[in-house]
């Protein structure tokens, strides 16, 4: 369960892929589209508001029933819109929603390296936000084989 309804911290950052392509958001026909693209040098990168939440992780291994804490994030590129996992379509979408946010808007934050992160679906462990055909998609990761897959690695820059 997520402890408390307020985030422990928030930050504004631009999101880019491991290969330095930018994640951008465009309003089209009253809905937002998400693109993965090379930005022209003079173009400003889109910023995303990352809100960080603590989540207790239950475990049978420790006596108190809690093995540790996870850090969950929500990502909002513009007011009232959040990235959400659509597990049925294996897609990542931007939806307008009110708080409390649905579980599909929460992602477990992984530091794969000090400057690379991955976003794992709260609602579908082992499934991560990734890049597929120049779009964001949900990608199932085999922990034993593809933990370092470049297509699920992202960089955050303030």
């Amino acid at each position: 369960s997520i402890t408390g309804i307020s985030p422990i911290t928030e930050s504004l950052a631009s999101l880019s892929t491991y290969n330095d392509q930018s994640i951008t958001f465009a309003l089209e026909d009253e809905s937002y589209e998400i693109y993965v693209e090379d930005l022209k040098k003079d173009k400003k990168k889109d910023k995303v508001l990352l809100s960080y939440y603590e989540s207790q992780h239950p475990s049978s291994e420790s006596g108190d029933g809690v093995d540790g804490k996870m850090l969950m994030v929500t990502l909002s590129p513009t007011k009232d819109f959040w990235l959400q996992a659509n597990n049925k379509e294996h897609s990542v979408e931007l939806h307008k929603c009110e708080k409390p946010l649905p579980d599909q808007a929460f992602f477990v934050l992984h530091n794969r390296s000090f400057n690379c992160v991955s976003f794992e679906c709260k609602t579908d462990p082992g499934v991560f936000i990734g890049v597929k055909d120049n779009h964001l998609a949900l990608i199932k990761v085999d922990y034993s084989e593809n933990l370092g897959s470049e297509n699920i690695l992202f960089k955050l820059s303030e």
């Epitope: 992780h57 540790g68 996870m70 850090l71 530091n111 794969r112 390296s113 370092g148």
Partner: antibody
Framework: EVQLVESGGGLVQPGTSLKLSCLAS????????MTWIRQAPGKGLEWIAS????????YYPDSVKGRFTISRDDAKSTLYLQMNSLRSEDTATYYC???????????????WGQGTLVTVSS | DIQMTQSPASLSASLGETVSIECLAS??????LAWYQQKSGKSPQLLIY???RLQDGVPSRFSGSGSGTRFSLKISGMQPEDEADYFC?????????FGSGTKLEIK
């Protein structure tokens, strides 16, 4: 209960090597970044090395880069620090620490071992 | 590297007194700032993380605040067991760096 127990410290001569171990228990070891931090006698704290929860990434300050190597054996829930070309300024108590969150570096170090003293002297 | 300048280096306080320790960073960063207490001959203990979040089991007289480059630790009502060294630490950028410490003694 989370426990971190360091071992392997001792008195060594300059230029020699030493390997420290840290046995972890009470938590799922392979879900956490692990870090070595040292403290010279009567001095402050110094970050020495970190390793990702996957073991795929390692990080060091310039003071030990190329001489020290951090590694982990998840099957044994053990963290290691291989220290080569030791210098007198490496004399310190070495602490094994665990990150605050699964998979993550954020939030400081809530768990520390008791420390193991390394003395480098001729 | 981010330098963490901690002040004062030492401090004497009477029992019940409110005490503040400050950490000044050489450059601004997100709030990945922790405070530790280290009693003589013991390992450090995490008091505060994320600049202001109290670690489980730590008395509520300890509090943290600040953002950007300026952070502080406050002890509201000094107790005998609070006599210790205190260190700040930033975790936003590698290399991870600590403040040089504040020795807090009872007057």
């Amino acid at each position: 209960e989370v426990q971190l127990v360091e071992s392997g410290g001792g008195l060594v001569q300059p230029g020699t090597s030493l390997k420290l171990s840290c046995l972890a228990s009470g938590f799922t070891f392979n879900n956490y970044w692990m870090t070595w931090i040292r403290q010279a006698p009567g001095k402050g704290l110094e970050w020495i090395a970190s390793i990702t929860y996957t073991g795929g990434g390692t990080y060091y300050p310039d003071s030990v880069k190329g001489r020290f190597t951090i590694s982990r054996d998840d099957a044994k829930s053990t963290l290691y620090l291989q220290m080569n070309s030791l210098r007198s300024e490496d004399t310190a108590t070495y602490y094994c620490t665990r990150a605050n969150y699964y998979y993550n570096t954020y939030g400081g170090f809530p768990y520390w071992g008791q420390g193991t003293l390394v003395t480098v002297s001729s | 590297d981010i330098q963490m300048t901690q002040s004062p280096a030492s401090l004497s306080a009477s029992l019940g007194e409110t005490v503040s320790i400050e950490c000044l960073a050489s450059e601004g960063f997100s709030n990945d700032l922790a405070w530790y207490q280290q009693k003589s001959g013991k390992s450090p203990q995490l008091l505060i993380y994320a600049a202001s979040r109290l670690q489980d089991g730590v008395p509520s007289r300890f509090s943290g605040s600040g953002s950007g480059t300026r952070f502080s630790l406050k002890i509201s009502g000094m107790q005998p067991e609070d006599e210790a060294d205190y260190f700040c630490q930033q975790g936003s950028k590698y290399p991870l760096t600590f403040g040089s410490g504040t020795k807090l003694e009872i007057k």
